[in-house]
Interface confidence: medium
């Protein structure tokens, strides 16, 4: 019964969040805000199984988001009271415990207003500092409810990185784009997590002809094209981005003229995949692969998908190829020979090689990164509430929908596919070697484009020496601390996660005249080949619903420490049957939180409402003021107590 109630509330919440929402900072004395805080604190206290209740100390920040429903996002400080949790008293009836012996805390919550009296907690994180001891974090997320999260949340970082790379790989614009500003972000806890992020992008001075990916040299062009993208991502039970979709509007720059292309001697250029100059390079490459691979059997190159060469001090080759497991075992064969045939049901590897050839030294230095291809786990959508997704399984592809201003949309392009092949020993997982495209960002020296599915490894966002460049203006994303999402952990992400905020000159230049398309779900599994559409002025679409496992009440900590591309590749479904196309532009609200626009001036005691300032003064007077120590901003998600 409890589950049904929650699902009903969540679905109602979802349906009610379909219209555009506006955010505003509000007075920390606002009466409805106080009711929201009351609901949040009562929720926290109800989950506190032992010890004393916590009592409000003061509200420090508050934002109100008004749409068809109203949300309050706020921070408040709490102190341990003298009433036990089981005392039957409300927190208002408790006094503060003696400061020296009292725990203190800071909570960040988002609460939805359902009616003048009904407030429901969507998400809440509390960092509690015991009187003596380390900070403890508790988290509550309403299971299935969509709620806004901070645009600076580090949880967004891997999705943003993936999104920017995906945009650059899948549109026909001649230049690379970089992240400008994250506008809004929402999250929904399901069996895994759904994210929806809207952000602006800006054209850089790096042309695709000369740059394979964003580097620190790529700078935004003040008069270049801009765009706004909405990315939709589902992070599954295996901690990978299981589905990803993107919808971008592009706005032409003011009087922008593409600078003349210079002849670039050191820039990579395509070479034929059957070029004789690749022969020796490939031999060394497969030798290196077999030497580094712990597999029992040798692999051989099945087909070369793409090859580029760059003239450096010597030559550097970038080769994308598929390797297949052979019948020759390493035990019985000293080396791979021509007679080694590929196994019918052997593993396939999607590989990217970077081979440095120094002719005058007669030396070849290959580096190879591979990931398994084709052994895919079937993901079924279970029965139960899943408001984000349509109900049937469809073909899985990844999409960028680019919508230009003043242009009609070209029809959806169906990318060329290789036929599926049965893999492994299971009768149910029956698709295999698809042409794919990799979406790596900031790879330093790697040009890795074809992203396989399955458990591929070593293809990280931010591998090598150029981790995560070009997402913000000079701001590096670095997730170097574990992001613990509940009990017992302090998160130290702080202000490392700036997504290039505040570059107003790139904010679409007031040209939002392109139609923003309805959201199309699609999936990271078999990613599309290079689009065949002629330019970014047409829309490139592939569609299909995303499977979501059933809702549950998880009780674990999810940690995003150093999220890499190898973690983004999901176990996915085979394309069983086509699904009806479903637009779901309104499955998540446009809710904006401005975490930077909050002032910190003292205000009068509640309920005086004349001064619209934050933080509020203490809820009750306390003999020894001992506010919670300022902590670095931390963002969490946890699946705990979703059904409590």
């Amino acid at each position: 019964m409890k589950l049904i109630t929650i699902l009903f509330l969540c679905s109602r919440l979802l349906l009610s969040l379909t219209q555009e929402s506006q955010s505003e900072e509000i007075d920390c004395n606002d009466k409805d805000l106080f009711k929201a805080v009351d609901a949040a604190l009562k929720k926290y206290n109800s989950q506190n199984q032992s010890n004393n209740q916590f009592v409000l100390y003061r509200i420090t920040e508050a934002t109100k988001t008004v749409g068809s429903d109203t949300f309050y996002s706020f921070k408040y400080e709490i102190k341990e009271g003298d009433c036990p949790v089981q005392s039957g008293k409300t927190w208002q009836d408790c006094e503060y415990k003696d400061a020296a012996k009292a725990a203190t805390g800071e909570c960040t919550a988002t609460v939805g207003k359902r009616s003048s009296t009904k407030f429901s907690v969507a998400t809440q994180t509390c960092q509690i500092t015991p009187a003596e001891g380390p900070v403890v974090t508790a988290q509550y997320d309403c299971l299935g409810c969509v709620h806004p999260i901070s645009t600076q949340s580090p949880d967004l970082e891997p999705i943003l990185r993936h999104g920017i790379q995906y945009f650059n790989n899948n549109t026909q614009h001649s230049s690379l784009f970089m992240l400008n500003e994250v506008k809004r972000a929402q999250r929904q806890v399901v069996a895994g997590l759904n994210f929806r992020i809207t952000y602006s992008i800006v054209q850089t001075n790096c042309s695709k002809e000369n740059f394979l990916f964003l580097t620190p040299d790529c700078k935004s062009l003040w008069n270049g094209d801009t765009g706004e993208c909405t990315d939709n991502a589902y992070i599954d039970i295996q901690l990978r981005i299981a589905s990803f979709s993107q919808n971008c509007d592009i706005y032409p720059g003011k009087d922008f003229v593409q600078p003349p292309t210079k002849i670039c001697v050191g820039c990579p250029r395509d070479i034929p995949t059957n070029s004789p100059e690749l022969e020796e390079t490939l031999t060394h490459t497969i030798t290196k692969l077999n030497a580094e691979n712990n597999a029992t059997f040798y692999f051989k190159i099945d087909n070369v998908k793409k090859a580029r060469v760059q003239v450096v001090a010597g030559k550097k080759y970038f080769i994308d190829f598929v390797a297949r497991e052979t019948t020759c075992s390493k035990e019985s064969n000293e080396e791979l020979t021509e007679s080694c045939e590929t196994k019918k049901l052997g593993q396939s590897l999607d590989c990217n090689a970077e081979v440095y050839v120094v002719p005058w030294e007669k030396k070849i230095y290959p580096t190879v990164n591979c990931q398994p291809l084709g052994m895919i786990s079937l993901m079924k959508r279970p029965p139960g509430f899943s408001p984000f997704r349509s109900s049937r399984i469809g073909e899985i592809k990844e999409e960028t929908t680019v919508s230009p201003p003043h242009t009609s949309m070209a029809p959806a392009q169906d990318e060329e596919r290789d036929s599926g092949k049965e893999q492994g020993h299971t009768r149910r997982h029956d698709w295999g070697h698809e042409k794919q495209r990799k979406h790596n960002l900031g790879h330093g020296h790697k040009h890795e484009r074809d992203q396989g599915h399955g458990h591929q490894r070593g293809h990280g966002l931010g591998h090598g020496h150029e981790q995560q460049h070009g997402l913000g203006h000079g701001h590096k994303f670095k997730l170097d601390d574990d992001l613990e999402h509940q009990g017992g952990h302090v998160l130290d992400h702080g202000h490392k996660h700036k997504h290039g905020h505040g570059h107003g000159k790139h904010k679409n230049k007031g040209k939002k005249n392109g139609k923003h398309n309805g959201w199309k779900t699609e999936h990271l599994a078999s990613s599309s080949e290079d689009s065949t559409t002629p330019s970014a002025q047409t829309q490139e679409k592939t569609e299909g619903p995303t499977p979501i496992p059933s809702l549950a009440k998880p009780g674990v900590t999810v940690t995003f420490s150093d999220f890499q591309d190898s973690d983004l590749i999901a176990t996915m479904m085979p394309p069983i049957s086509p699904a009806p196309i479903q637009s779901d532009d309104d499955w998540i609200p446009d809710i904006q939180i401005d975490p930077n626009g909050l002032s910190f001036n003292p205000i009068s005691d509640f309920p005086d409402t004349t001064s619209p300032k934050c933080p509020g003064r203490p809820w009750k007077s306390v003999s020894e003021i001992n506010p919670t120590t300022q902590m670095k901003e931390s963002y969490y998600f946890d699946l705990t107590d979703g059904l409590s």
């Epitope: 492994g424 458990h455 490894r457």
Partner: antibody
Framework: EVQLLESGGGLVQPGGSLRLSCAAS????????MNWVRQAPGKGLEWVSV????????VYADSVKGRFTISRDNSKNTLYLQMNSLRAEDTAMYYC???????????????WGQGTMVTVSS | DIQMTQSPATLSMSPGERATLSCRAS??????LAWYQQKPGQAPRLLIY???IRATGVPARFSGSGSGTDFTLTISRLEPEDFAVYYC?????????FGGGTKVEIK
């Protein structure tokens, strides 16, 4: 031959620390998410933690979070479990495990180590 | 957390008999359910995953069925080596959880 070999178990006092290792061989370790699963004497199996192939993502069971840290060194084909603030209830056989066959999606474990015993007692 | 409940706790059978083990989830796990066999002093061994798919090398006498919340492991004809403890496990959502086990012993 695909193999996982745990080590590092032993007797430790409550509040103490221990670091378990799991050496992998016979497969490309860096392709797979790795898990720790434990089993208290005479009891059932309890999943402890998982780490993604690159080590970037980790998940912990409630019972260990904040005390245990899972990590991996792909260059050494080794999985680790750093256990701090150990309690008597952490006494168990600790197994590392993975869903080696890709089809399993990492959630069903067909490769297990032989286990290493951790005893927390004063 | 999703609770996994196995029944019976102990099953006393003779070789050659048909054994039916039950596993119930506190909420739907679709078909994301695995069965393991564990013998004393050994690590568990995966028998069935995704409710009904036999893992490599598992004899055909082992079969799994069910979806949602109710699952069954059937051993069509018990062999002497089948006497062991059997666990079910869901992989729908964090944390992954196991049932308490069913001990299949010789009558």
């Amino acid at each position: 031959e695909v193999q996982l070999l745990e080590s590092g178990g032993g007797l430790v006092q409550p509040g103490g620390s221990l670091r378990l290792s799991c050496a992998a061989s016979g497969f490309t370790f860096s392709y797979y998410g790795m898990n720790w699963v434990r089993q208290a004497p005479g009891k059932g199996l309890e999943w402890v933690s998982v780490i993604s192939p690159s080590g970037g993502l980790t998940v912990y069971a409630d019972s260990v979070k904040g005390r245990f840290t899972i990590s991996r060194d792909n260059s050494k084909n080794t999985l680790y479990l750093q256990m701090n603030s150990l309690r008597a209830e952490d006494t168990a056989m600790y197994y590392c495990a993975t869903g080696f066959a890709v089809q399993h999606g990492g959630g069903a474990f067909d490769i297990w180590g032989q286990g290493t015993m951790v005893t927390v007692s004063s | 957390d999703i609770q996994m409940t196995q029944s019976p706790a102990t099953l006393s059978m003779s070789p050659g008999e048909r054994a039916t083990l039950s596993c119930r989830a506190s909420q739907s796990v679709t078909t994301y359910l695995a069965w393991y066999q564990q013998k004393p002093g050994q690590a568990p061994r995966l028998l069935i995953y995704d409710a009904s798919i036999r893992a490599t090398g598992v004899p055909a006498r082992f079969s799994g069925s069910g979806s949602g919340t109710d699952f069954t492991l059937t051993i069509s004809r018990l062999e002497p080596e089948d006497f062991a403890v059997y666990y079910c496990q869901q992989r729908t959502i964090w944390p992954l959880t196991f049932g308490g086990g069913t001990k299949v012993e010789i009558k």
